[in-house]
């Protein structure tokens, strides 16, 4: 069977009050029934993926290949889409039966493995409406949600979570750090109908909260009162000059004075050299600028805080989370160094199912993947050591040869004669 599954398992009306768990969230009534799997792709059928995924028609875009990479936990199960050409844009997408997440949870999940030790490149997915022209998917194509890791230099190692709200891409206000090692990692985004969200990496929560709090979808609830302004007599000075303090009479002394110890050189010629002036020195009695003593300001009122009012432009939106139409999952990326592998894509409405699926895919092969990598690293270390040893041996041999060349020729006599002649070994 195809590894791309599109299933509709909505609740039957007869079962609603028996088998279904009914949850009430603000104005949203929704049913928690059998998991609906809108999209699942594990690349388990060889080249079958090529008929399900569509590439952008542009010759200079990078090619995806099916591969489990240089190391893996299971050579077949860990096969995924791997970027194969450096410094390229990539555009590949798969469509599925369109659905809306209104009144239900949305879970987007996939694995990413940057086995190339990535320097700059995307590892995120975009969810598009089914109106997308897949042959012309590009960076400006309007999407619903963008989610996943992104690395570019030391400054960017983050998980993007971007929602298109009323035609505008809105970025999360939190910084979620992504994994930047060479192993496979599981990324999960959960968006719930109560306008809350959760981001998981490797099936562990790394961020959660409310959509309204963590994105700028809506105008702020409060604004500074435009009719309020600081009263003119509002005194924000904590300290003031002491009006009773006055400068001592002997305070003002020049900063520099002529050096009293300086003497005019004997060979000084006033006609030739002009009038002699002694060099100046720092005046030890100079006290600097006089400043009156500071006292507490009796009129001090503190820092004026601009009062806030309810923002008349704010109104809550209980359906921030909801989209009418999801129909395409796309990889729209740039990679400087290629080698990233994408696998185990899942779009569902069931958090528990997604977690289970993650454990059965990424969870099952992660230990073996690390083992294989460790073994490869060990072998590489051994090879490096062997190479180093060989190099050292060659160097020693070369040095010996050089020494022999440099030392005087040994006389062809017996040892006894040689000793008598006073010849010693070099």
């Amino acid at each position: 069977s195809s590894s791309l599954e599109v299933l509709f398992q909505g609740p039957g009306l007869n079962d609603i009050f028996e088998a279904q768990k009914i949850e009430w969230h603000e104005e949203n009534l929704y049913f928690q029934g059998e998991p609906a799997v809108y999209f699942k792709e594990q690349f388990l059928d060889g080249d079958g993926w090529t008929s399900r995924w569509i590439e952008k028609h542009k010759s200079d875009f990078g090619k995806f290949v099916l591969s489990s990479g240089k190391f893996y936990g299971d050579e077949e199960k860990d096969k995924g889409l791997q970027t194969s050409q450096d410094a390229r844009f990539y555009a590949l997408s798969a469509s599925f039966e369109p659905f809306s997440n209104k009144g239900q949870t949305l879970v987007v999940q996939f694995t990413v493995k940057h086995e190339q030790n990535i320097d700059c490149g995307g590892g995120y997915v975009k969810l598009f409406p089914n109106s997308l022209d897949q042959t012309d998917m590009h960076g400006d194509s309007e999407y619903n949600i963008m989610f996943g890791p992104d690395i570019c230099g030391p400054g960017t190692k983050k998980v993007h979570v971007i929602f298109n709200y009323k035609g505008k891409n809105v970025l999360i206000n939190k910084d979620i750090r992504c994994k930047d090692d060479e192993f496979t990692h599981l990324y999960t985004l959960i968006v719930r109908p109560d306008n809350t969200y959760e981001v998981k990496i490797d099936n562990s929560q790394v961020e959660s909260g409310s959509l309204e709090d963590d994105w700028d979808f809506l105008p702020p609830k409060k604004i500074k009162d435009p009719d309020a302004s600081k009263p003119e007599d509002w005194d924000e000075r904590a300290k003031i000059d002491d009006p009773t303090d006055s400068k001592p009479e002997d305070w003002d002394k020049p900063e520099h004075i002529p050096d009293p110890d300086a003497k005019k050189p004997e060979d000084w010629d006033e006609e030739m050299d002009g009038e002699w002036e002694p060099p100046v020195i720092q005046n030890p009695e100079y006290k600097g600028e006089w400043k009156p003593r500071q006292i507490d300001n009796p009129d001090y009122k503190g820092t004026w805080i601009h009062p806030e009012i309810d923002n008349p432009e704010y109104s809550p939106d209980p359906s921030i989370y909801a989209y009418d139409n999801f129909g395409v999952l796309g990889l729209d990326l740039w990679q400087v160094k290629s080698g990233t592998i994408f696998d185990n894509f899942l779009i569902t409405n069931d958090e528990a199912y997604a977690e289970e699926f993650g454990n059965e895919t990424w969870g099952v092969t992660k230990a073996a993947e690390k083992q294989m990598k460790d073994k490869q690293d060990e072998e590489q270390r051994t090879r490096r050591m062997m190479r180093t040893k060989m190099r050292m041996r060659r160097m020693r041999r070369t040095r010996r040869k050089m020494r022999r060349k440099m030392s005087p020729a040994r006389p062809r006599t017996s040892c006894r004669e040689a000793c008598l002649q006073g010849w010693t070994e070099a």
Epitope: D140, C152, G153, G167, K168, W334
Partner: antibody, heavy 127, light 107 residues
Framework: EVQLVQSGAEVKKPGSSVKVSCKAS????????ISWVRQAPGQGLEWMGG????????NYAQKFQGRVTITADESTSTAYMELSSLRSEDTAVYYC????????????????????WGQGTTVTVSS | SYVLTQPPSVSVAPGKTARITCGGN??????VHWYQQKPGQAPVLVIY???KRPSGIPERFSGSNSGNTATLTISGTQAMDEADYYC?????????FGGGTKLTVLG
């Protein structure tokens, strides 16, 4: 934070070309998009084009297409703007400005604004 | 091509709230940035992504954006806020600036 230092003032004859440089320091050059913006005396800001050094490709405002060339040399962390076929209306202060990428896509800088500007280079075109 | 329209000038009394608008077709769907420019100086980014403040920009600067209008609001305006202000957005990989607004602080 990155700092941008531009080359000195230029006086040019109509029909000639000018090449202005913008050297970045104190940041990773490849993590920024560099825009070139000009301002004629008493006028507003006008975007001419930009480049993202890590992607290598430049894009230009339609008005300047064919007359402006923007390049970047990653080895020296320097961006260049060359404007050809100069006319008196090109007399202006030319600024380079950087926007952080904060992502591996060329569109990321759209979100962050031009947060660092060079000091400006005055170009006078006069016969 | 995309056009952003700003009023040429706005006046405000010290301590009062100044509002500078930037009009554009469906500008609410774009990220809008605002720059302050004082005479003889390079522009300075004061608001990005509609309403976020870069570090070092006073709290009195705020922004909003919806429908066909983006707005820069300066509450408790000070004499030092007198400058030219420009809005900017991206359209089809091209940066577009508004014509600029001269803010005059009276008195």
């Amino acid at each position: 934070e990155v700092q941008l230092v531009q080359s000195g003032a230029e006086v040019k004859k109509p029909g000639s070309s000018v090449k202005v440089s913008c050297k970045a320091s104190g940041g990773t050059f490849s993590s920024y998009a560099i825009s070139w913006v000009r301002q004629a005396p008493g006028q507003g800001l006008e975007w001419m084009g930009g480049i993202i050094p890590i992607f290598g490709t430049a894009n230009y405002a339609q008005k300047f297409q064919g007359r402006v060339t923007i390049t970047a040399d990653e080895s020296t962390s320097t961006a260049y703007m060359e404007l050809s076929s100069l006319r008196s209306e090109d007399t202006a202060v030319y600024y380079c400005a950087s926007s952080p990428l904060r992502g591996s896509g060329w569109y990321w800088h759209y979100y962050y604004g031009m947060d660092v500007w060079g000091q400006g280079t005055t170009v006078t075109v006069s016969s | 091509s995309y056009v952003l329209t700003q009023p040429p000038s706005v006046s405000v009394a010290p301590g009062k709230t100044a509002r500078i608008t930037c009009g554009g077709n469906n500008i609410g769907s774009k990220s809008v940035h605002w720059y302050q420019q004082k005479p003889g100086q390079a522009p300075v980014l004061v608001i990005y992504q509609d309403r976020k403040r870069p570090s070092g920009i006073p709290e009195r600067f705020s922004g909003s954006n919806s429908g066909n209008t983006a707005t820069l609001t300066i509450s408790g305006t000070q004499a030092m806020d007198e400058a030219d202000y420009y809005c900017q957005a991206w359209d089809s990989s091209t940066a577009v600036f508004g014509g600029g607004t001269k803010l005059t602080v009276l008195g």
